[in-house]
């Protein structure tokens, strides 16, 4: 507890003090007072630097004194032998004695009293900026007229803060301008404009005179502009050293003028105005700005339109343009949106064709579709080359965005038929010689594949079984071979309307219009053993002449077997119809005259006993295309005959091309279109 006075005596005083003692006293007087410590008696063993025994006076970290030996008063009217005056309210006294004393020493007697200190004069640092007033136990500061005492109760300043300027134009000056500004003041001015306007400050050099910087370049008095996280200044000196036009890029500006105690000058004067916030003319690649201006400011709106082949992608939606507004913060809205190259995406796959994985799917990239050659070709032209267009579609010069269509190549066998050893009027054949050959198991017959979805056959083959099972791709019709080949499932059978349906088909004598189409449920995949035959053209080039050669194939009756195990084939010439009429019917079911011969029939055969027979019905009579020697077309279909091994009659397919095309078109699926 602080006291105003007190006494300090060495141990055993006034008797001799003991050896090896260390004792300390902490003196504390009230705040605002100093301490006067005085010794009235001092008798301590003397040693150099008081090393043996001593009394030590410490103020804070400073040793005020160290005493030893004997002292007596110099003044007969005063008992004080030694005294100390400190301007602080705390003091420590420490007494130490060593292990031996040569004589008997009595120690010391000391007294302390609280003394008033003059804070206004006793310290190096003046506590008040202007006037200092001392009183017992403290002091107070006071200010000259028009100044006020700051909250720290030490500093005086002028009342120059708190002004807020909201007008779009204005003038601000230092206090008393152009008279000297007040010392020791901090003046803060706030400019607060509507959002979207930036504060622009203008000064004239001659309107600025502020105490110059010290030798280290630090302003003693300073003017600072703060706009958000940007600072302009500090500025000081004679004549404004900064830019005469300060664009703050902010609608809020704080002006801070700080002065010290000395060196007042005339100060400063500035003007400000609000400019609509400018937005930078940004370089947005691959786009055009509308309207185009040299400068854009707050509330300006531009339409940014992507160049062809570029788009702005927001989420999953692609657009070709977007609007951007110059915002109050000087930034464009939608600034994250960019015109990126259009991405056409992974190209769609096509049936029976392929497209190489593109290196890029962006605008301008090129891809190429190819068909699975040699079994398919590109029907709708265009060469298969597509480029990624500006609208995000893969586009072909001819077809536009329409995909290429790979359709089967017709009439081209993978291996040409060569007549090998003679086998009862024909030769062994391989399915690769006749990849269009279709096998019907009930009744045992043939047919010709004409495209992915359609099989052409004779009407008499399907009239009794409208759900025939068919196979393609096998030379042998042994069960194990057919199990490995492709089974075709019919969707619908279309018999020519001119074919007369009989109650007893076995007694038929009229085979006119012996033609039918079978629509398949699923498309047939083409390859070396499965490939369609062409249809005849409608021009006169496809009119057959006597002697024209055609190929027939099938698993029908041979001289040795009722049914061939492996495919057989023969090359035979077209003959005049009368040759067929002249042959006697082997097992007539009616009078010979009852058999009907029409222009819808082709007569062929008669050479070396080569002929089609029971079980070959519906198969193609394949003739080389007069306009493309690499291809075969179905000139006829095995229909009927008077006698195996002589002449046979074949349905003249050319006469039915219109019906075939019409039937296929009317019964196609969207998938096939």
């Amino acid at each position: 507890e602080p006291t105003m006075y007190g006494e300090i005596l060495s141990p055993n005083y006034p008797q001799a003090y003991p050896s090896e003692v260390e004792k300390s006293w902490d003196i504390e007087v009230p705040e605002g007072y100093g301490i006067h410590l005085y010794f009235t008696h001092l008798d301590i063993e003397l040693s150099e630097n008081c090393a043996y025994d001593s009394v030590q006076i410490i103020s804070g970290d400073t040793e005020e004194g160290r005493l030893c030996g004997q002292r007596s008063s110099n003044n007969p009217h005063s008992p004080i032998v030694e005294e100390f005056q400190v301007p602080y309210n705390k003091l420590q006294v420490i007494f130490k004695s060593d292990f031996s004393n040569e004589e008997r020493f009595t120690g010391f007697a000391a007294y302390y009293v609280a003394t008033d200190i003059n804070e206004c004069t006793d310290f190096v640092d003046v506590p008040c900026s202007h006037f200092c007033n001392n009183f017992i136990g403290g002091y107070f500061c006071s200010c000259p007229p028009e100044y006020f005492l700051h909250d720290d109760m030490k500093n005086c300043g002028v009342n120059c803060s708190g002004d807020v300027f909201t007008a779009l134009i204005g003038e601000i000056a230092s206090p008393n301008y152009p008279k000297p500004y007040p010392e020791n003041s901090r003046c803060e001015y706030q400019i607060r404009l509507e959002k979207g306007f930036q504060v622009v400050v203008t000064l004239r050099r001659e309107d600025f005179d502020v105490e110059a910087a010290d030798s280290a370049g630090n302003c003693l008095d300073s003017l600072v502009f703060v706009a958000g996280d940007r600072q302009f200044g500090p500025y000081c000196g004679h004549g404004f050293p900064g830019p005469l036009n300060i664009e703050t890029k902010s609608n809020a500006l704080d002006i801070i003028f700080q002065t010290d105690l000395t060196g007042q000058k005339k100060g400063w004067k500035l003007r400000y105005h609000g400019d609509p916030m400018p937005c930078p003319k940004e370089d947005t690649p691959n786009s055009v700005w509308e309207p185009a201006k040299a400068k854009y400011v707050f509330r300006d709106v531009v339409q940014i339109t992507c160049l062809d082949g570029f788009e702005v992608v927001e989420g999953r939606v692609g657009a070709t343009s977007f609007y951007s507004t110059c915002q109050s913060n000087g930034k464009w809205s939608n600034s994250k949106l960019k015109c990126q190259p259009v991405d056409c995406g992974i190209p769609e796959s096509i049936e029976n064709g392929k497209v190489e994985d593109p290196e890029s799917t962006l605008f301008g990239s090129v891809i190429r579709y190819t068909c699975e050659e040699p079994y398919y070709y590109m029907e709708n032209g265009g060469g298969g080359e597509y480029h990624c267009a500006g609208n995000g579609s893969w586009v072909n010069e001819v077809l536009g965005p329409e995909l290429p269509k790979c359709v089967p190549v017709c009439g081209v066998p993978r291996e040409p038929f060569e007549e090998k050893q003679r086998i009862i009027g024909g030769s062994d054949a391989d399915i690769k010689n006749f990849p269009w050959q279709v096998f019907f198991d009930n009744p045992w017959a043939g047919g010709a594949l004409i495209n992915e979805y359609w099989v052409l056959t004779a009407a008499h083959v399907v009239e009794g079984n409208r759900e025939p099972t068919m196979y393609v791709g096998s030379t042998s019709v042994q069960t194990s071979r057919l199990a490995k080949s492709k089974m075709l499932t019919p969707e619908h059978v279309f018999i020519h309307p001119g074919w007369k349906l009989l109650e007893v088909p076995e007694g038929r004598t009229n085979f006119d219009n012996d033609i039918a189409l079978v629509r398949l449920k699923d498309p047939v995949k083409m390859g070396p053993t499965v490939s369609p035959i062409c249809l005849p053209g409608t021009s006169s080039d496809y009119n057959l002449m006597d002697g024209d050669l055609g190929l027939i194939s099938g698993w029908g009756r041979t001289e040795k077997r009722d049914r061939a195990v492996r495919l057989k084939a023969a090359r035979l010439p077209v003959a005049p119809l009368r040759k067929c009429k002249e042959v006697k019917v082997e097992k007539p079911t009616a009078d010979a005259e009852a058999y009907v011969f029409t222009p819808n029939m082709i007569c062929a055969g008669g050479e070396k006993g080569m002929d089609s027979c029971k079980g070959d019905s519906g198969g193609a009579f394949a003739v080389q295309d007069p306009n493309d020697k690499t291809k075969f077309y179905a000139a006829g279909l095995v229909s009927w005959g008077p006698q195996c091994g002589t002449y046979g009659l074949y349905t003249r397919v050319k006469n039915y091309v219109d019906w075939i095309m019409k039937t296929m078109q009317e019964n196609s699926t969207p998938r096939e279109d």
Epitope: F439, D441, N442, W444, T469, T475, S476, V477, Q478, T479, S480, R481, L482, A483, K484, M487, K560, R561, R563, V565, R566
Partner: antibody, heavy 119, light 107 residues
């Protein structure tokens, strides 16, 4: 009329081999696919293998792989089946069977050859 | 290889009964399934091929159905001549497999 005539019954010791023949009459062997099927007394039918004329290779059931050999002599229209390393469980009637056409699996069966394996 | 499982292994029935035998393949064989009838000491006789096609000369009381892995042989009205063992057979590739057989005996 096509017929399959098989060789007569055989009695063999364990470890020995047996070769059963099957002669085709009324047709040529080249036009046919010959299969071999066996049936142990009181047991079910077991398919052993066949010669595939299209591929020119013989296909054997996994069970008989390495022990059975099927050959054909087209000059005499005779098919052969040889089974080696005989054991008692090989005692069975061995049939040669022609493959059918157009979905019919087996067309014609031989009369069967009884092979007895006994020590 | 494909496994063929026939059920039941034995079936007791009377003349005039409707009899059904089933055959299950371990994997799909489409419609490549045949049914045979075998009498003691005789070679098997083909009844049905391609799951449902009746071999010529076989009485119409025999019928077959199914595709994929499940197949059925039905005798609509059992006759005295029908007491025999029946086998199913898969032949969708060159590895042909028989079922273990179903013996139809007189009740």
């Amino acid at each position: 009329e096509v017929q399959l005539v098989q060789s007569g019954a055989e009695v063999k010791k364990p470890g020995a081999s047996v070769k059963v023949s099957c002669k085709v009459s009324g047709d040529t062997l080249t036009e046919l696919s010959m299969h071999w099927v066996r049936q142990a007394p009181g047991k079910g039918l077991e398919w052993m293998g066949t010669f595939d004329p299209e591929e020119g290779e013989t296909i054997y059931a996994q069970k008989f792989q390495g022990r059975v050999t099927m050959t054909e002599d087209t000059s005499t229209d005779t098919a052969y089946m040889e089974l080696s390393s005989l054991r008692s469980e090989d005692t069975a009637v061995y049939y040669c069977v022609t493959e059918g056409l157009a979905g019919v699996p087996f067309d014609l069966w031989g009369q069967g050859t009884l092979v007895t394996v006994s020590s | 290889d494909i496994q063929m499982t026939q059920s039941p292994s034995t079936l007791s029935a009377s003349v005039g009964d409707r009899v059904t035998i089933t055959c299950r393949a371990s994997q799909s064989i489409s419609s490549w399934l045949a049914w045979y009838q075998q009498k003691p000491g005789k070679a098997p006789k083909l009844l049905i091929y391609k799951a449902s096609s009746l071999e010529s000369g076989v009485p119409s009381r025999f019928s077959g159905s199914g595709s994929g892995t499940e197949f059925t042989l039905t005798i609509s009205s059992l006759q005295p001549d029908d007491f025999a063992t029946y086998y199913c057979q898969s032949y969708n590739s060159y590895v042909w497999t028989f079922g273990q057989g179903t013996k139809v005996e007189i009740k």
